[in-house]
Interface confidence: low
């Protein structure tokens, strides 16, 4: 049967017989060995497996030069087989053997779970010599044991190339349950089932699990670890934890918050970055996401105009970056803009609406009835036109841009002139004789330059030719402008 030592506050003196300090007064119990010349080694039986021959820790002495008498078999004495103690306690255990003095240089090593313990372990070997034998006691001590000290410890001794192995000493460090898996925070859909997992280990086993929701126990009947709690669904945020119990006491896991996914809060602080005649760049700060990642956002645009039909333009965009360029807007118009974002649950309310305006646009039509004729006496070209019919959105007319291109013998030169908004005629100096002059005119507002009129060409002859006939823009639908000389 296994000898089992239960926990005490003191370290254990775990070799049988008297303490080393008393060996001087009484050797018999620890060192008495039969010395009869006819001694034959008998089978020994393992304390851990009764009835099975056990020879693993026995060395059969050889015949020596001192004579032919057989020495007894060498074996470690039986000691405590199982030590159970709590974390942070100190423990000391040992193994002992009596070795005939004919053997020299005996050393004992300690092994744990098949690996030799080297270095900074507290192992002490003491020798107690007598006339014929030496008692050897190897002690091993651990201060403030941890769970990692759990395992099977043995002594090994080498004699004459034979290895003698002690019975194992099992160290079991017990403590409060230790979590190997704790519940995790989750964001869940309202009234939808979900699972939480909790796992803890000893020793001592078993470890029983209780679940706690908002400070109240969920299960009055504990479950053996590991435990999976299936929550059928929640309607509001809850905090869950699990309690792990064993014979040593209770450990409580971290509390985890289970959030209920909801529609997001509306975006805040919608800002205008810049606006052009037909676009407005906005940004916003996302609201709280409702415990579910944003999927996309919707920019809603209403024209603020008593005459508009009040319809809302909707532009869908990704949730990030939190910016959007609203396009296809009318020039010089006022708009009310709001932003809403959605997650898997649904759309947020619309942000506070902000007002924004587009700037003036460029004119959409060119000046009309452009005519060009040569005033040879002044050596200039006279240009006339009619003011275009611009829409209000184009803004206030600030002037005209005149393009005149001079082409002669493979050379081409374009010049630009700007004239004020009150003008409907202009004169430009002749740049080249014996050349073609092509004239186009565009209206200009603060919003930009409008389209150029169709080109009107006039031939500038060499000096001495006379021409007073104008060239003009054709009526709509006509072919290319006609050059009149």
């Amino acid at each position: 049967a296994i000898t089992e030592a239960r926990e005490e506050a003191k370290p254990y003196p775990l070799f049988p017989g008297p303490l080393p300090g008393s060996l001087q007064t009484d050797h018999t119990s620890l060192l008495s060995l039969p010395h009869t010349s006819g001694y034959q080694p008998a089978l020994m039986f393992s304390p851990t497996q009764p009835g099975r021959p056990y020879t693993g820790n026995v060395a059969i002495p050889r015949v020596t030069s001192a004579g032919s008498k057989l020495l007894p078999p060498l074996a470690f004495k039986h000691t405590v087989g199982h030590i159970i103690l709590s974390e942070h306690k100190d423990v000391k255990f040992n193994c002992s053997i009596s070795v005939p003095n004919i053997y020299q240089d005996t050393t004992i090593s300690w092994w744990k779970d098949g690996k030799e313990l080297l270095g900074a372990h507290h192992a002490i070997t003491q020798f107690y010599p007598d006339d014929e034998v030496t008692a050897i006691i190897a002690s091993f001590s651990i201060t403030s044991v941890q769970r990692s000290d759990n395992g099977s410890y043995i002594c090994k001794m080498k004699i004459n190339n034979e290895e003698i192995v002690s019975d194992p000493i099992y160290i079991e460090v017990q403590g409060l349950p230790h979590f190997t898996k704790q519940p995790e925070s989750m964001n869940v859909t309202r009234n939808t089932a979900f699972n939480l997992t909790c796992q803890a280990v000893g020793p001592p086993e078993p470890v029983n699990i209780f679940w706690v929701q908002n400070s109240s126990r969920v299960n009055e009947q504990p479950e053996k670890s590991p435990s999976v709690l299936t929550v059928p669904g929640l309607t509001e945020m809850a905090v869950f934890s699990c309690e792990a119990h064993n014979d040593k006491g209770l450990t409580v896991s971290k509390g985890v918050q289970i959030n209920i996914k909801a529609i997001p809060s509306p975006p805040t602080e919608v800002s205008i970055h810049n606006s052009t005649a037909h676009s407005i760049l906005i940004s916003w700060v996302p609201g709280f996401d409702g415990y579910s990642p944003f999927r996309n956002c919707s920019v809603q645009v209403k024209e603020v105009d008593p005459l508009s039909n009040g319809s809302v333009m909707i532009f869908n965009t990704s949730a990030s970056p939190h910016m959007y360029q609203i396009k296809q807007l009318q020039a010089l118009a006022n708009y009310s803009i709001g932003v809403s974002c959605m997650n898997e649950i649904g759309w947020s309310a619309v942000s506070p609406w902000i007002l924004a305006s587009t700037t003036e646009g460029a004119p959409s039509v060119a000046p009309l009835n452009v005519t060009v004729f040569l005033n040879e006496s002044r050596d200039n070209v006279d240009i006339r036109w009619m003011k275009p019919l611009t829409k209000r959105q184009a803004g206030e007319l600030v002037g005209y841009r005149i393009s005149h291109v001079w082409q002669s013998a493979g050379i081409s030169k374009e010049l630009l002139e700007e004239v004020g908004q009150n003008n409907s005629r202009a004169q430009i100096s002749v740049q080249v004789h014996n050349a073609t002059c092509t004239v186009r005119i565009a209206a200009v507002t603060k919003g930009g330059v409008g389209p150029f009129s169709d080109p009107v060409k006039i031939f500038i002859p060499a000096h001495g030719w006379v021409d007073h006939a104008p060239s003009s823009t054709p009526a709509p639908g006509n072919a290319d402008p006609v050059l009149i000389i």
Partner: antibody, heavy 118, light 107 residues
């Protein structure tokens, strides 16, 4: 409580690259954008960029677009910023900062002092 | 990008004095944030949405402004207020931009 942990210092040679880390704890990592800010000794603050841990989408200050790369490890709730082709101009304190739902940089790391020197 | 110009760059004031730091934006922004930074420490959010005090900020601080002009005011300066203050905008972004900072010292 919310914490952003950054290594105290990094020393690198010119021309090399470095990856700065920012380990977040005390809140749900994927719910908040992470920003990075540079501060040269005795100077002001410069915004480098931001990254959304839910989908790794990043915005950069154009000035730092070629210099920095933002990334994440969701499993360890850690944000990273890689800085490449380092010069002495990159010697600075680099902060990570959490951005809350309302666009506020509400929690900042202690900053990593990067020294670029041969 | 929006450039934020803080003034003054450095100022010195006595305890009990009223102190105002201004922040001018190169184009209109819809709100302003302010941070406080003391030597060797990270910046701290101090004021957000132009006028709201962050958690733990004493009531002697206030913020105001609109458009391109914003300010941070301390009604009665205390020793612990000595620090560098930065304004920050994110109306026009990216990039987020900061002012160059105002160093407030005690006389």
């Amino acid at each position: 409580q919310v914490q952003l942990q950054q290594p105290g210092a990094e020393l690198v040679v010119p021309g090399a690259s470095v990856r700065l880390s920012c380990k977040a704890s005390g809140y749900t990592f994927i719910n908040y954008w992470m920003h990075w800010v540079k501060q040269r000794p005795g100077q002001g603050l410069e915004w480098i960029g931001e990254i959304d841990p839910s989908d790794s989408y990043a915005n950069y200050n154009q000035k730092f677009k070629d210099k920095s790369t933002l990334s994440l490890d969701k499993s360890s709730s850690t944000a990273y910023m890689q800085l490449s082709s380092l010069t002495s101009e990159d010697s600075a304190v680099y902060y990570c900062a959490r951005c809350d739902y309302y666009g506020r940089l509400d929690y900042w790391g202690q900053g990593t002092t990067l020294t670029v020197s041969s | 990008q929006v450039v934020l110009t803080q003034s003054p760059a450095i100022m010195s004031a006595s305890p009990g004095e009223k102190v105002t730091i201004t922040c001018s934006a190169s184009s209109s922004v819809s709100y302003m944030l302010w941070f406080q930074q003391k030597p060797g420490t990270s910046p701290k959010l101090w004021i957000y949405s132009t006028s709201n005090l962050a958690s733990g900020v004493p009531a002697r601080f206030s913020g105001s402004g609109s458009g391109t002009s914003y300010s941070l005011t301390i009604s009665r300066l205390e020793a612990e207020d000595a620090a560098t203050y930065y304004c920050q905008q994110r109306s026009s972004y990216p990039p987020i931009t900061f002012g160059a900072g105002t160093k407030l010292e005690l006389k």
